[in-house]
Amino acid sequence: PRSIDVKYIGVKSAYVSYDVQKRTIYLNITNTLNITNNNYYSVEVENITAQVQFAKTVIGKARLNNITHIGPLDMKQIDYTVPTVIAEEMSYMYDFCTLISIKVHNIVLMMQVTVTTTYFGHSEQISQERYQYVDCGRNTTYQLGQSEYLNVLQPQQ
């Protein structure tokens, strides 16, 4: 079998809301993946599991099941949303993200995603990690491919 390539394209949108009483930030982050099937037969994308970390703490998780199938030598673009919550011991970030004296409130998040594909009863997992800047002070939407090169640094292999 040939490879199945997973490419993390980047953040498609980040929608922010706040709970002032709880000093909590809610970030709904939609990411885009390109999955390429280099085989001469179809493969199923069984599930996508994703998580987002801030300062080494997991702030959000998501799982998509029975997503799609990808035909021979074909590629599919898949969006997935991870609802994240920055709260409790990280509530100090609420002050930063709602700071009225500045307009740009960048934070670095680590996006982790694992794609499980199956073909002929065989299962394969491919994982990707990227560090991304997100502005926790405002809503952001991207045109296709606009955020492709946003990774701050590649994680250690």
Epitope: A14, T98, I102, V104, Q132, G137, R138, T140, L150
Partner: antibody, heavy 118, light 113 residues
Framework: EVQLQQSGPVLVKPGASVKMSCKAS????????IHWVKQSHGRSLEWIGV????????NYNQKFKGKATLTVDKSSSTAYMELNSLTSEDSAVYYC???????????WGQGTTLTVSS | DIVMTQSPSSLSVSAGEKVTMSCKSS????????????LAWHQQRPGQPPKLLIY???TRESGVPDRFTGSGSGTEFTLTISSVQAEDLAVYYC?????????FGAGTKLELK
């Protein structure tokens, strides 16, 4: 329906002060910042400053520090701007504008016309 | 402060024409972290308050017709109206939304021939 209802036109003498209001309705007042913008006759727009109704935090354009004072009354969901030591240069339309925290201006009030003349 | 320069100051057009107006900033409006340009376009019709058209340089506000398109990056931005309608006659302002103090261009006035 979101509304920012501003007080009516004012005519004042040079040297006086004026306090204009912006009453918010149709949303949770404390969840959004209120900005104030000046538009002199036939001219562009100037940002005066912003206030957070939740905690009264403010940020002023240096140019308007000492000229404008921004306040809010949470109980009536009303934002105020006081302008002091008025001169003819202060004659303008003043808008209050809403933003969800650091997001973009999404709703503008209808404006308050201030005329400073002796 | 970031200075916003718009050109031309006025445009005379016929209904159905395509129109392009320019906005230049004295400093970059690109958030180098998330690669988003923090520029907005507002439309002000005669006797009315301004109204948000476009934010993030290229994202149309909800309810804004798709004949309005924003583009550009860094310090150079463009607002295009693909086919001008009578209701588009207004003054268009670009706005720095990247850093305080927020600043506006002097405006481009769109008039009918």
């Amino acid at each position: 329906e979101v509304q920012l209802q501003q007080s009516g036109p004012v005519l004042v003498k040079p040297g006086a002060s004026v306090k204009m209001s912006c009453k918010a309705s149709g949303y949770t007042f404390t969840d959004y910042y209120i900005h104030w913008v000046k538009q002199s006759h036939g001219r562009s727009l100037e940002w005066i400053g912003v206030i957070s109704p939740y905690n009264d935090n403010t940020n002023y354009n240096q140019k308007f520090k000492g000229k404008a004072t921004l306040t809010v009354d949470k109980s009536s969901s009303t934002a105020y701007m006081e302008l002091n030591s008025l001169t003819s240069e202060d004659s303008a339309v003043y808008y209050c504008v809403r933003t969800y925290y650091s997001n973009y201006f999404d709703y503008w009030g209808q404006g308050t016309t201030l005329t400073v003349s002796s | 402060d970031i200075v916003m320069t718009q050109s031309p100051s006025s445009l005379s057009v016929s209904a159905g024409e395509k129109v392009t107006m320019s906005c230049k900033s004295s400093q970059s409006l690109l958030n180098s972290g998330n690669q988003k340009n923090y520029l907005a376009w507002h439309q002000q019709r005669p006797g009315q308050p301004p109204k948000l058209l476009i934010y993030g340089a290229s994202t149309r506000e909800s309810g804004v017709p798709d004949r309005f398109t924003g583009s550009g990056s860094g310090t150079e931005f463009t607002l295009t109206i693909s086919s001008v309608q009578a209701e588009d006659l207004a003054v268009y302002y670009c706005q720095n939304d990247h850093s305080y103090p927020l600043t506006f261009g002097a405006g481009t006035k769109l008039e009918l021939k």
